[in-house]
């Protein structure tokens, strides 16, 4: 009998009520592997979740977060509110970065400014709550006749969470 069930492909289930015939998954359910005895209920993307990929008979729906929120956890199991650049999300809500720190993202915590002197460089552009300092050439390079340094590229684009 087990062999009969193993023949049931993804998108179907092995129906015990019908002599183990392979029946299609009912609406709003799916089976992503063959040989399943039941189909799983499709995930519904409601509230702060929005649908990224519709459910099919062989794969679950995939959710994203609505504007103003970002995903956390495997398969975007949670949506957490965004903050503004220059802020960090604490357990009590969004809070401005303290002096000496910045956040150029809408999520995460405030990061300490780069200490240019650790690499023997000088500060070319001061840091803000939203931007790191820009380091320039070392003070010795700034003597008369020394060529001016090209400033580094603008701040990086946001990355992605470890999902």
């Amino acid at each position: 009998l087990q062999d009969l069930c193993s023949n049931c492909p993804a998108g179907t289930f092995c129906d015990n009520n019908r002599s183990q015939i392979c029946s299609p998954c009912p609406p709003n359910s799916f089976s992503s592997a063959g040989g399943q005895r039941t189909c799983d209920i499709c995930r519904q993307c409601k509230g702060v979740f929005k649908t990224r990929k519709e459910c099919s008979s062989t794969s679950n729906a995939e959710c994203d977060c609505i504007s103003g929120y970002h995903c956390l956890g495997a398969e975007c199991s949670m949506c957490e509110q965004d903050c503004k650049q220059g802020q960090e999300l604490t357990k009590k809500g969004c809070k401005d970065c303290c002096f000496g720190t910045f956040n150029d993202q809408k999520r995460g915590i405030c990061r300490p400014w780069t200490n240019c002197s650790l690499d023997g460089k000088s500060v070319l552009v001061n840091g803000t709550k939203e931007r790191d300092v820009v380091c320039g050439p070392s003070p010795a390079d700034l003597s008369p006749g020394a060529s001016s340094a090209t400033p580094p590229a603008p701040a990086r684009e946001p990355g992605h969470s470890p999902q």
């Epitope: 915590i109 790191d132 969470s161």
Partner: antibody
Framework: QVQLVQSGAEVKKPGASVKVSCKAS????????MHWVRQAPGQGLEWMGW????????NYAQKFQGRVTMTRDTSISTAYMELSRLRSDDTAVYYC?????????????WGQGTLVTVSS | SYVLTQPPSVSVAPGETARITCGGD??????VHWYQKKPDQAPVLVVY???YRPSGIPERISGSNSGNTATLTLSRVEAGDEADYYC????????????FGGGTQLIILG
Amino acid sequence: QVQLVQSGAEVKKPGASVKVSCKASGYSFTGYYMHWVRQAPGQGLEWMGWINPNSGGTNYAQKFQGRVTMTRDTSISTAYMELSRLRSDDTAVYYCAREPGYYGSGLDYWGQGTLVTVSS
Amino acid sequence: SYVLTQPPSVSVAPGETARITCGGDDIGDKRVHWYQKKPDQAPVLVVYEDRYRPSGIPERISGSNSGNTATLTLSRVEAGDEADYYCQVWNSSSDHPGVFGGGTQLIILG
């Protein structure tokens, strides 16, 4: 897929320097900070510092300031960690690890590690 | 600088639940990450930001964080879970932003 591939094992004498490389692939190298973490034999993980591959900006753990230099070559998507004035207690496996795109989350991808042995 | 304290080892029988703690002053106000480290392998992120699992990490691994203690919980423990586990936080202070706990060896009995 994201991969971080590190340079091979090194044996150094006390007082020498070592430079470990970490070549990134499968993502935009300049979009994600790179961190360096080490583990000495029988010891725990120890954070050493980070580099922003886009700007070259760095931050080093106080313990390593003055001895460590983190650099990058964006043309070959490679980060480097150089440790100078080596001592026997610098014998460790050195790892590069990628930050996931914002500060305050876990390090989601790691290199395979580079064993640095400091011995006279 | 900020200190994270972990027990050196935790022992548990297969199929039971293991709880590994990570203590720190007001750690509940921080975001805690947990890594699994096996011999001769790179660390693997198993929980981030207190309680979220990256893709591929089984649901029987979970995390919590409040007050002065964060906890990593492994239910229905298997032999393959035997490893060292490290908690970690980030600070906004510039002298030592990255801090790891001392690590806990999870020992599977029998």
